[in-house]
Interface confidence: medium
């Protein structure tokens, strides 16, 4: 017969004839002959193949360095590769999350208009008249001054984009 | 934190230390242990993260284990084969990594035990 | 191999003095600010001072400053006082993840 010009899914065409190829999670030893099957290999612990493949070797589980702010988010098997994704208080700095950043945190007198995610940066936006935020923070937002007439107060000391109003006893009329 | 006595040990034995932590959680930093030979400066040998995933310099990765039992709030260094080049003052330090709440900190170690001197010798 | 080179010692300052410290990393530290300082004295464990570079840590005297970033740091002590005589280290973090620190650098009170 003809040898063959193409081969089947999940076969590949070497020496003119149609081996199978290895199945994810494992890599090829030898090729067919007309004698045996394709020979193929489970991948070692901490490889994987993804795909039905004719690779001779694995390829390793992407590794998360924690230098970079990265942790494991799914452990890699034989046939998938490790997910990692930032630590806390940290995003990636691209799509494919090969390394994160620590999220800004927003200085006294500004608040977090929006709270950091895994893939964005913290929005910090400047606390409007009447408040004010006196910690350096990714999570907090700007506290509105605290009303003094509400506790039956007077204001002693104004407040600014960066401190509280300061709060005391009415002055009452000598008789 | 607080390493366990050190003591005297012949060249080929098997070190166990155990640091002792209060006051924070395992599960939300990592401990490392550093080394520091007699009069000579200070050595990485690896850290446990808050995940129980163990990290190690090079040079300790082959002979070098480090465990943690979170309900004894204990971290373990286990290393093999010692030799006279093994004798120093044996220190843990929480670190370098913290994550949790609106901090995160990296790269630093900090408290650190009163550490405790291995002696290897014939 | 990453390398951190310090300041040589010993290095000597009067009371009331300033002394810089600097430590050069033989490659870039992870994040550019993996890098921070110790104090330690005879049969005691280093103390942190400063961590990501220039961070002051907790309880200590304002008069420790961090700077640098990449590969160039320096530690600079002013105001120096009889305490702060000791030995200072710097240590770096790397991509690994690695942890080096430099060779320490002693310094004395005049």
């Known amino acids: 017969p003809e040898p063959p010009t193409a081969c089947r899914e999940k076969q590949y065409l070497i020496n003119s004839q149609c081996c199978s190829l290895c199945q994810p999670g494992q890599k090829l030893v030898s090729d067919c002959t007309e004698f045996t099957e394709t020979e193929c290999l489970p991948c070692g612990e901490s490889e994987f193949l993804d795909t039905w493949n004719r690779e001779t070797h694995c390829h390793q589980h992407k590794y998360c360095d924690p230098n970079l702010g990265l942790r494991v988010q799914q452990k890699g098997t034989s046939e998938t590769d490790t997910i990692c994704t930032c630590e806390e208080g940290w995003h990636c700095t691209s799509e494919a999350c090969e390394s994160c950043v620590l999220h800004r945190s927003c200085s006294p007198g500004f608040g977090v208009k929006q709270i950091a995610t895994g893939v964005s940066d913290t929005i910090c936006e400047p606390c409007p008249v009447g408040f004010f935020s006196n910690v350096s923070s990714a999570f907090e937002k700007c506290h509105p001054w605290t009303s003094c007439e509400t506790k039956d107060l007077v204001v002693q000391q104004a407040g600014t984009n960066k401190t509280d109003v300061v709060c005391g006893p009415q002055d009452r009329l000598r008789a | 934190v607080k390493e366990s006595e050190g003591g005297l040990f012949k060249p080929t034995d098997t070190l166990t230390l155990t640091c002792t932590v209060s006051g924070f959680s395992l599960s939300s930093y990592a401990i490392s242990w550093v080394r520091q030979a007699p009069g000579n400066g200070l050595e990485w040998i690896g850290a446990i993260d808050r995940y129980g995933t163990t990290y190690y310099a090079t040079w300790a990765k082959s002979r070098s284990t480090i465990t943690r039992n979170t309900n004894e709030n204990t971290v373990t260094l286990k290393m093999t084969s010692l030799t006279a080049a093994d004798t120093a003052t044996y220190f843990c330090?929480?670190?370098?990594?913290?994550?949790?709440?609106?901090?995160?900190?990296?790269?630093?170690?900090?408290?650190w035990g009163p550490g405790t001197l291995v002696t290897v010798s014939s | 191999a990453q390398v951190l080179t310090q300041t040589a010692s010993p290095v000597s300052a009067a009371v009331g003095g300033t002394v810089t410290i600097s430590c050069q990393s033989s490659?870039?530290?992870?994040?550019?600010?993996?890098l921070s300082w110790y104090q330690q004295k005879p049969g005691q464990p280093p103390k942190l001072l400063i961590y990501?570079?220039?961070t002051l840590a907790s309880g200590v005297p304002s008069r420790f400053r961090g700077n640098g970033s990449g590969t160039q740091f320096t530690l600079t002590i002013t105001g120096m006082q009889c305490d702060d005589a000791a030995t200072y280290f710097c240590?770096?973090?790397?991509?690994?993840?690695?942890?080096?620190f430099g060779g320490g650098t002693e310094v004395v009170v005049k």
């Open positions: 330090a929480r670190g370098p990594w913290y994550y949790g709440g609106d901090v995160a900190w990296t790269g630093s170690f900090d408290p």
């Open positions: 490659q870039s530290v992870a994040n550019n600010d993996f």
């Open positions: 240590t770096g973090g790397y991509a690994g993840p690695i942890y080096i």
């Open positions: 990501g570079a220039s």
